[in-house]
């Protein structure tokens, strides 16, 4: 075993991964308190599935239970054989009830596809249990599944392109061994953050993979490079999204959760950020006129840094319900920004920004601001990221975001902040006077910013207000307005035009 | 109609084992989960845990861990609470009541109640 | 464990007029626009009966005089006007995802 052993914190549990297999266990040694796995002096439990038929949007109607073999349940509760039906199926489970997202997904597919089945599957007693073993149990789920839509595919008019499995965590690996073991192939598996530990890098037939379906979407909202990764790294599906990254979701932070909890944990902020996937998802149903869009890009950081906001050759596309079927790409990884609430969609705008002069930058990176004024509304100010470093004589390129629709651009304002905000950069600062002290104050030339706006696929070229006046130092600010050649449209279509 | 009847009072020795049961009718019994509420006189409600009415899985709230124990006889769609070597603080009214497993897990219906008394 | 406490722990309100009961949680007890909130009316030798649910539901069968509102951790049930049948102790209950449910210490509600 190795010397140094990471304990990586999962909800209020730990686990202690050494050479790459998991042990579990938990504080004060009340593991098993913690996750019932069941005692002699428990009633044993029935290693069983239920399918309920969710046959009401009111959350406390009981619904139909299907079973596989019984037809009068379906004539019963009008199973509508020629209908989509979706398959809801939970993850694992600490406290063994359907937690609260369970219900705003139903009612959302209800709310968005009417004559729709929507059946639940309930798995509780087999995810009720300690997280290893939960996995163990995917695989029985996954056939309980197949047999189900197996028996339903023996019906006249049912089909199983009609069919869109749905899992969130260890759900979305059990949509995956359900789509492998079934005759035929399901239309769609959507995958809400898959579960991370003992599914990353497992072979393709031991997790959720594009092979499952004819068309697998992924949405990823808890992955760490460092630490436990709550939800899988790797794309495993035709498309994968990446939300913020995939990491850190807007609203999730422990500022956030803590301001409405008085004494809330690294708990909180876990599931927020897990289930921030299904919101997502629930988003796109509900908010139809209002889709997100994520944009292929190799990694996160090429994508902060702005330069994948293309929609040429499909790489660009809604997120959720509304996604295009990609059977084409396997493991596309795509990226977007949100807002902190539904609706989630936010407009990405490129910006290019050539500097073609530079003096007295010193050790510190300059902190820029822009605010973006349109025929719709303005923006707040916001922050240019820095992702690698300003380069000089060079064309940089930034990504921004607003929440509102500004409409057509009319104006940027470029603003270099001035006081330096942290005690380091001052030091920094300070040490770059003391090594140049009879350099005149830092500046930058810039005389053009292009702008291309992610969800219209438009660029723009802004020149300066005074063409004489192109330099900007700390404490300053540069306006910008379009430039006399206005609009230019590229070849490039709009995402807006593909929404299904 | 819904209802839930739960088994008459009983007087209890200090440690002796106690099993009161919670009959349901009116739905079916299976598709809806148990709970079991602890009353001591003059006081408040105190919720002792639940109770999945399909798997048979029992779940304690911490204070209920160990000599507390819930069953289920399906077939007559009846829960049951067991107590274990019973004590003066045990003395209490317990109800049952039913959530919804897709809800929001409030308990729409009760049983009457089932008066526990230590005598001495 | 969700703490609730509610407050008064008895009031005396005179026929007709409003009853105002509040439950505090110490920490929110929201998701995702739903305060998972309930409140239960218990008589002298009588189990709970569900009022409200979801902080702002009304069972059905109770009557409209009884409403709940609030959010995230503050949470009022108001009567109004308040009859004679009222006369009883008011628990509110969390149920949110995790377990435990708690339940308030109670308010006993006399008529004047």
């Known amino acids: 075993m190795s010397n140094s052993v990471p304990l990586l914190c999962f909800w209020s549990l730990c686990y202690c991964f050494a050479a790459g297999s998991p042990v579990p266990f938990g504080p004060e040694g009340r593991l098993e308190d913690k996750l019932h796995k069941p005692k002699a002096t428990q009633t044993e439990v029935k290693p069983s599935v239920r399918f309920n038929l969710r046959t009401s949007k009111d959350p406390e109607h009981e619904g139909c239970y299907l079973s596989v073999g019984h037809s009068q349940p379906l004539e019963d509760c009008s199973f509508n054989m020629t209908a989509k039906t979706f398959f809801i199926i939970h993850g694992w489970t600490m406290s063994g009830i359907f937690e609260n997202w369970l219900h705003k997904l139903v009612s959302a597919l209800h709310t968005r596809e009417k004559d729709a089945n929507v059946v639940v599957v309930d798995w509780l007693p087999l995810a009720h249990q300690l997280y290893t073993d939960a996995v163990n149990n995917t695989r029985v789920v996954g056939h309980s599944i197949a047999r189900m839509l197996d028996w339903l595919q023996e019906k006249d008019d049912f089909s199983l392109g009609n069919v869109h499995l749905i899992g969130y965590s260890l759900g979305a690996h059990v949509a995956g061994y359900a789509g492998n073991f079934v005759k035929g192939t399901v239309g769609r598996i959507t995958g809400l953050d898959p579960a991370g530990p003992m599914f990353e890098g497992a072979d393709i037939h031991k997790r959720l993979s594009p092979d499952d379906a004819d068309f697998v979407d992924v949405l990823h909202t808890y992955t760490r490079s460092f630490g436990l990764s709550i939800g899988i790294q790797m794309p495993v599906g035709h498309i994968d999204i990446y939300p913020n990254g995939g990491d850190f979701q807007p609203g999730c932070g422990l500022n956030d959760v803590l301001g409405s909890i008085a004494y809330g944990t690294i708990t909180e902020v876990v599931k927020c950020e897990h289930e921030r996937a299904v919101h997502l998802f629930v988003d796109s149903l509900v908010n139809q006129d209002k889709p997100s869009f994520a944009f292929q890009c190799t990694d996160s950081n090429r994508f902060k840094k702005g330069i994948c906001l293309s929609c040429r050759k499909n790489r660009c596309n809604s997120i959720g319900y509304n996604a295009k079927k990609m059977r084409n790409k396997r493991n596309s990884k795509m990226y977007l920004k949100t807002r902190a609430g539904m609706p989630f969609r936010v407009y990405h705008y490129q910006m290019k920004i050539h500097v073609f002069s530079y003096k007295n930058m010193g050790e510190i990176e300059p902190t820029f601001y822009v605010t973006l004024y349109g025929t719709n509304a303005d923006s707040q100010t916001l922050p240019l990221e820095i992702v690698e470093r300003i380069e000089q004589n060079a064309t940089n390129t930034f990504l921004v975001y607003t929440e509102e629709d500004l409409g057509d651009l009319l104006k940027i304002q470029l603003t270099w902040e001035g006081a330096s905000q942290s005690w380091y950069n001052l030091w920094k600062e300070f040490r770059s006077y003391l090594s140049q002290p009879r350099n005149p104050g830092r500046e930058l030339n810039i005389r053009r910013i292009r702008v291309k706006s992610g969800e219209t696929q438009r660029k723009l070229t802004f020149c300066t207000e005074d063409p004489e006046n192109t330099s900007i130092s700390p404490g300053r600010e540069l306006w910008f307005r379009k430039c006399r050649d206005g609009w230019r449209m590229k070849n490039e279509t709009s995402p807006t035009v593909e929404l299904p | 109609q819904i209802q839930l009847v739960q088994s008459g009072p009983e007087l209890k020795k200090p440690g002796e084992t106690v099993k009161i049961s919670c009959k349901a009718s009116?739905?079916?019994?299976?598709?809806?989960?148990m709970n079991w509420v602890k009353q001591a006189p003059g006081k408040g409600l105190k919720w002792m845990g639940w109770?999945?009415?399909?798997?048979?899985?029992?779940t304690y709230a911490d204070d209920f861990k160990g000599r507390f124990a819930f069953s289920l006889e399906t077939s007559a769609s009846t829960a049951y609470l067991q107590i274990n070597n019973f004590k003066n603080e045990d003395t209490a009214t317990y109800f049952c009541?039913?959530?919804?497993?897709?809800?929001?897990?409030?308990?729409?219906?009760w049983g009457q109640g089932t008066a526990l008394t230590a005598s001495s | 464990d969700i703490v609730l406490t509610q407050s008064p722990a008895s009031l005396a309100v005179s026929l007709g007029q409003r009853a105002t009961i509040s439950c505090k949680a110490s920490?929110?007890?929201?998701?995702?626009?739903?305060?998972?909130m309930n409140w239960y009316q218990q008589k002298p030798g009588q189990p709970p009966k569900l009022l409200i649910y979801?902080?702002?539901n009304l069972k059905s069968g109770i009557p409209a005089r009884f409403s709940g509102s609030g959010s995230g951790t503050d949470f009022t049930l108001n009567i109004h006007p308040v009859e004679e049948e009222d006369a009883a102790t008011y628990y509110c209950?969390?149920?949110?995802?995790?377990?435990?449910?708690?339940f308030g210490g109670g308010t006993k509600l006399e008529i004047k």
């Open positions: 009116g739905y079916t019994f299976t598709n809806y989960g």
């Open positions: 009541a039913r959530f919804s497993y897709y809800g929001r897990h409030y308990f729409d219906y």
């Open positions: 109770i999945n009415t399909y798997s048979g899985v029992p």
């Open positions: 209950q969390q149920t949110t995802d995790d377990p435990p449910w708690t």
């Open positions: 979801a902080a702002s």
């Open positions: 920490q929110s007890v929201d998701y995702d626009g739903d305060s998972y």
